[in-house]
């Protein structure tokens, strides 16, 4: 009696289930008793010696790639063997890489955690997932498991972070890259600063008074306001970061505290308060202001 | 297949601006930097700078900080190089490139925009 | 700023012979990450230039393999084995490891 193994299916891809059958084409298992092995090169499978012709494995890698064959054995200890058949799993080359922000679009606060998802759309066995920071790639973390996403995880983030990244993701047939995804950091704004300039040391009245206000931190764009007394004189506007001035004509009643606040919709800071006093000096015809 | 299609040569005075176009097509336009480089008349290759159409983040060759903007319009997948206060040693022919990153090579080219300042 | 000088300026060939260009950078273009973007780009007459080799060695798909790389450091090398007619034109080493990124004056390959 010859023996024969089947492999279904017999091109398997990584992943993917694969039965033996330990077949005897002139023999009906069922007019003996027999009991079966199946082999990979000289290893035994599975359970070892067992009445069942057929043998599940629940996933085939390309490790798994070998010289397959099964035996027979009768009541009587007669061994029957299978001739050998080659069973080649089939890797699925990566395809489609992606990267994804957590959280998404890619703008993040200062001091908050930013995930950079890596994925694969295609691709078995064991991926390894590359992440680089920069145009001209800095290589930040590799990581290699049997999944189609992987993680990289910045737990704090900082304002140097603010760059562009990408990811690799390469099994044995050449690294793929994903696009490019552009991180943003935003920055709350800082306590800001605020400078009285006037033309002359002591300013006069009909001087045109300069209030300028600057946070030294804070991501664009920053909208300034203005107050003499907790009252509004007006707010400016630094769509590209850094200060913004507001100017005044001096009249008496401009004498007093006056304040800025900075706010870039992450946060509104007061500046400390500037004190500006008339002082009428000996044989001046004038008022002037000192602050 | 990609593409990177450059707008028409351009003839402009002393003093005036120009703003060249570059339309992408056959792949992800936010996915890849483009670059932008100048090549006077029977010079050479000058680098200019790049833009990233996700973010419209360009940066620049200092050369060229001040004279040059690059922005980029992801609705259309076109990059645009505008260049200012132009002179007449600003006469060249002005490429758009796409830059892979991890390979790192320039792997497509516009066709070049020759732009002609002249009195 | 990398100066990136190529010599000759000026390379007459005889069809079927070897060509060699030289390229030299005024400081190593050895980028912090341990790679070295040196490429080499043909521009031929009335054309946009295109790649031939990436990161100093490793010639871009559909070039023939008559084209190869080599150096490192600073001094760099593209030879063509055996030069056809297609190959006339002028090549242009770049860098692209430090900022600002810069190209070579060209060399103007022409058959003799």
């Known amino acids: 009696a010859e023996l024969f193994l089947i492999a279904s299916p017999s091109h398997p891809t990584e992943g993917s289930p694969v039965t033996l059958t330990c077949k005897m084409p002139f023999l009906q298992s069922s007019d003996a008793q027999f009991q079966f092995c199946f082999f990979r090169d000289t290893r035994a499978l599975g359970p070892g010696w067992s009445s069942s012709p057929k043998l599940q494995i629940a996933a085939m890698w390309k490790e798994d790639t070998g010289s397959y064959w099964c035996e027979a054995q009768t009541m009587a200890s007669k061994v029957l063997r299978s001739r050998r058949s080659q069973i080649n799993v089939h890797r699925v080359p990566v395809a489609d890489v992606s990267l994804e922000t957590q959280p998404p679009g890619g703008q993040v606060m200062e001091g908050d955690r930013l995930v950079l998802i890596c994925s694969v759309a295609m691709g078995t066995g064991d991926i390894t997932f590359l992440w680089y920071k920069g145009a001209v790639g800095l290589n930040l973390q590799s990581k290699t498991q049997r999944s189609l996403t992987a993680e990289y995880e910045i737990p704090s983030v900082r304002e140097s972070d603010a760059e562009q990244y990408y990811c690799v993701a390469e099994n044995g047939y050449g690294p793929s890259p994903s696009g490019l995804v552009s991180i943003t950091v935003r920055i709350p704004v800082s306590r800001p600063i605020l400078m009285l300039r006037a033309p002359r040391a002591q300013a006069a009245v009909e001087d045109v008074l300069e209030l300028h206000c600057e946070a030294l931190r804070g991501s664009p764009p920053i909208l300034y306001w203005f107050y003499h007394e907790d009252i509004t004189l007006g707010s400016r506007s630094a769509p590209s970061g850094g200060g913004a001035s507001f100017n005044l004509s001096l009249t008496e009643e401009h004498s007093g505290n006056y304040s800025c606040e900075a706010n870039n919709g992450l946060g509104a800071q007061r500046s400390e308060a500037v004190t500006l006093n008339f002082t009428v000096p000996t044989g001046a015809r004038s008022n002037h202001l000192t602050s | 297949q990609v593409q990177l299609v450059q707008s028409g040569a351009e003839v402009k005075k002393p003093g005036a601006s120009v703003k060249v176009s570059c339309k992408a097509s056959g792949y992800t336009f936010t996915s890849y930097n483009i670059h932008w480089v100048r090549q006077a008349p029977g010079q050479g290759l000058e680098w200019m700078g790049w833009?990233?159409?996700?973010?419209?983040?360009?940066k620049y060759n200092e050369k060229f900080k001040g004279k040059t903007t690059l922005t980029a319009d992801k609705s259309t997948s076109t990059a645009y190089m505008e260049l200012s206060s132009l002179r007449s040693e600003d006469t060249a022919v002005y490429f758009c490139a796409r830059r892979i990153h991890y390979y790192d090579y320039f792997d497509y080219w516009g066709q070049g925009t020759l732009v002609t300042v002249s009195s | 700023d990398i100066v990136m000088t190529q010599s000759p300026l000026s390379l007459p060939v005889t069809l079927g012979e070897p060509a060699s260009i030289s390229c030299r950078s005024s400081q190593s273009i050895v980028h912090s990450n341990g790679n070295t973007y040196l490429e080499w780009y043909l521009q031929k007459p009335g054309q946009s230039p295109q790649l031939l080799i990436y990161?100093?060695?490793n010639r871009f798909s559909g070039v023939p393999d008559r084209f190869s790389g080599s150096g490192s450091g600073t001094d760099f090398t593209l030879k063509i084995s055996r030069v056809e007619a297609e190959d006339v034109g002028v090549y242009y080493c770049?860098?692209?490891?430090?900022?600002?990124?810069?190209f070579g004056q060209g060399t103007k390959v022409e058959i003799k």
């Open positions: 833009i990233y159409p996700g973010d419209g983040n360009p």
């Open positions: 770049f860098q692209g490891s430090h900022v600002p990124w810069t």
């Open positions: 990161k100093v060695s």
